[in-house]
């Protein structure tokens, strides 16, 4: 049987080497000489030769300093043989435990740790965690029992201990109130990790803490009073630029200004924010009227895109806006004037007076009138009074210039301001009808076939309006009824049917047709009739040589 006491060997032993560890014995040595050997890691396998055994005495020895952090346990096998080389014992496993020395200092996992915390955070707020490791034995010794401490804080403001560290976990948290990004945006802590529960080997690292922004500073007007002026009637005109400062982080919602006009019920002004420099740009939202109000005193408040995190006073500014008088165009009243007038209105007579009002009540100005558009050249205007009269006969049936019985003229009024301003009015002459047009046939040129001619419909047209139109009366004159007949085509007598009484020779004929309207205004019209060499309906008329007998009836 083997006699092997427990074996442990401290790491980093000084020497001299080899050094005795234990004496191995087999109780078979009572029966005869026993020779000892060892095999295994550290003996005959790498690292070879760390352990040796005296062949005859069984003294197990170590030949060099050990490093627990490299190999913490060696497993060897002891062998015993007699002088003839036969084994006297089964091989026995030997465990050599390397005991720890505090030969490794803690090492932080990073040289620089980064964390952040919101400004104004209360004590208790977690910021970040730092971590260190130690290669020494943390099971049987305190050689790897790390304790964390903060060695320094830069800046030491507003208090030298703004943060604390959990000595066991390395978690850094806020311990003092008063974190203010606008005063101290970053803190640099030197943190220490020390083994032996803080009493042993130590190392340091840096923790950089960024204080993040909250909206704890209001935008503030500087200056708080402004003056500006703007011409009347102009929208989207820049009046002045409002300046603010905000101590919060630039180009964030806590910094970006939002302007509100507190006393602009009419919505006549607007303030937009310049995204680059946060200025407020005050502009007109609509045209202002100098004659109504010459000065506005605006109160403008400024806040941020996001609400204030804390109770803050809203900054306000006063803007005095002077409205500048601009020469405004005369205004026709009404802007569109309708006048009913008979189309036979006498030339040179006054139809109406169409005048404009001068908006510039603070300026004494003279208005001059001119006709700007009078396409038929029917009108003239008194330049001083705006009285409009006819210079030529009106004609309701002048369909080039008259639409739906309405003749449109444009009148302009010009003041003598500087610069000159011109206003426009529209004159609508509603022309009432006079029975000045007799009925006429349509068409006036008619084709018949020589054989089996088809009767032709002739429409009766009158440019006038009822009652100066249908029902019409039609009558063939100058002997035309000898060869031709007419009859009314419809009850309103707005068309007639013309047909020959007998077979006619191919050729051209002229027929006199008298037409009379409902008011007995009549007119004789000559119809041009061609008889063609065809049968039925005269579509394409192939006429024979014209009859040279002259007028054929």
């Amino acid at each position: 049987d083997w006699v092997i006491p427990p074996i442990s060997c401290p790491e980093n032993e000084k020497g001299p080497f080899p050094k005795n560890l234990v004496q191995i014995k087999s109780n078979k040595d009572k029966e005869g000489k026993v020779f000892y050997s060892i095999t295994g890691q550290g003996a005959d396998t790498p690292p070879v030769g760390v352990f040796i055994i005296e062949r005859e005495t069984g003294w197990l020895k170590v030949t060099e300093p050990l490093d627990r952090e490299r190999i913490a346990t060696y497993t060897l096998f002891s062998h015993a043989v007699s002088s003839n080389g036969n084994a006297v014992e089964d091989p026995m496993e030997i465990l050599i435990t390397v005991t720890d020395q505090n030969d490794n200092k803690p090492e932080f996992t990073q040289e620089v740790f980064k964390g952040s915390v919101m400004e104004g955070a209360l004590p208790g707020t977690s910021v970040m965690e730092v971590t260190a490791t130690d290669a020494d034995d943390d099971v049987n010794t305190y050689n790897a029992a790390i304790a964390y401490t903060i060695l320094s804080q830069d800046p030491e403001l507003p208090d030298k201990n703004m943060f604390t560290i959990n000595r066991n976990t390395g978690v850094i948290s806020v311990v003092t109130t008063g974190l203010d990004r606008e005063s101290f945006p970053t803190y640099t802590l030197v943190v220490q990790a020390a083994d032996l529960q803080g009493e042993g080997l130590s190392t340091t690292a840096t923790a950089v803490i960024t204080v993040t922004d909250t909206n704890d500073n209001p935008p503030i007007f500087n200056p708080t009073t402004y003056k500006g002026q703007v011409p009347e009637n102009e929208a989207n005109v820049v009046i002045t630029t409002l300046k603010v400062t905000d101590a919060d982080a630039p180009n964030t919602p806590a910094w970006e200004a939002v302007y509100t006009i507190l006393n602009d019920d009419g919505g006549q002004f607007v303030v937009t924010t310049n995204p680059v420099n946060n200025d407020g740009i005050l502009k007109t939202a609509k045209g202002l009227d100098f004659e109504a109000k010459q000065q506005y005193i605006l109160h403008v408040a400024v806040t941020n895109v996001v609400p204030f995190e804390v109770s803050l006073t809203t900054s306000t500014a006063t803007v005095t806006v002077d409205v500048l008088d601009v020469n405004e165009a005369p205004i026709f009243v009404p802007p569109e004037k309708r006048v009913e007038v008979s189309e036979d209105f006498g030339v040179g007579q006054e139809i109406t007076s169409y005048t404009a009002q001068e908006p510039d009540t603070f300026m004494e100005q003279k208005i001059t009138y001119r006709i700007w558009r009078d396409t038929a050249n029917w009108l003239e205007i008194n330049p001083d009074t705006g009285a409009i009269s006819t210079r030529a006969e009106l004609d309701r049936e002048d369909f080039e210039h008259v639409k739906n019985s309405t003749y449109t003229a444009l009148i302009i009024a010009t003041d003598n301001g500087s610069p000159v301003a011109t206003g426009t009015g529209t004159l609508l002459l509603i022309l009432s009808d006079v029975n000045d047009n007799a009925p006429i046939p349509e068409p006036r040129t008619i084709f018949f076939c020589e054989r089996n001619p088809k009767p032709q419909v002739i429409n009766i047209i009158d440019a006038d309006l009822p009652p100066n139109t249908s029902p019409f009366t039609a009558e063939l004159t100058h002997g035309a009824s000898a060869n031709w007949t007419i009859q009314y085509n419809d009850p309103t007598q707005e068309s007639i049917i013309l047909k020959p009484k007998m077979a006619l020779e191919v050729g051209d004929y002229k027929i006199n047709l008298k037409l009379m309207d409902n008011q007995n205004k009549d007119q004789v019209t000559t119809l041009e009739v061609s008889v063609c060499d065809c049968e039925g309906a005269a579509g394409v008329c192939r006429k024979a040589q014209p009859v040279e007998a002259g007028l054929q009836i």
Epitope: M118, L122, P123, N166, R167, N168, G178, T214, E309
Partner: antibody
Framework: EVQLLESGGGLVQPGGSLRLSCAAS????????MSWVRQAPGKGLEWVSA????????YYADSVKGRFAISRDNSKNTLYLQMNSLRAEDTAVYYC??????????WGQGTMVTVSS | QSALTQPASVSGSPGQSITISCTGT?????????VSWYQQHPGKAPKLILS???KRPSGVSNRFSGSKSGNTASLSISGLQAEDEADYYC???????????FGGGTKLTVL
Amino acid sequence: EVQLLESGGGLVQPGGSLRLSCAASGFTFSSYAMSWVRQAPGKGLEWVSAISGSGGSTYYADSVKGRFAISRDNSKNTLYLQMNSLRAEDTAVYYCAGSRTVQFDPWGQGTMVTVSS
Amino acid sequence: QSALTQPASVSGSPGQSITISCTGTSNDVGAYNYVSWYQQHPGKAPKLILSEVNKRPSGVSNRFSGSKSGNTASLSISGLQAEDEADYYCTSYTMGSTFMLFGGGTKLTVL
């Protein structure tokens, strides 16, 4: 002289509301986190709520969360505690206390809140 | 049940010394050097007598001292006087929204 003066305590029925005030003087109020600490009759001290110097951060004990609201007005150097849905177990002397680092100093003299029907 | 454990009462004769313990965990007393002690006389507001384990505010007698070992902090009062009879409370910083833990209080009787 550093001073904190509580007011607003009194008798209130269960389910009722009360608003406590704490007027500060003699120190830079906005530089201090402020807390309310209460003490039930014959019992120990219990932390109730805290608010940062700017008023941007607040904490509450689990026993009052959702019922009490802490606030401050730095322009008036005043701390408030709005207490709603009051219960019999909220009966206590309520102290306001200031803190720069994690200790309470100064303290007010306290105001008694009694919740009883 | 308070977060920090204190003896309910201690007593001592005038001139003697006494110690009041305050036991927490490795997340509060054991983790930070932010243990404070308060003295409260009957009907009065608490008064800070020690901060950061052993720092005395101005005006506090040097008979009061503090120490910490592991998860336990201690308040020692030497040369007991009649006016020391009061309730004593410890507090410890802990990370989180309940940043201050209170002990249950210890009644000191001067015999």
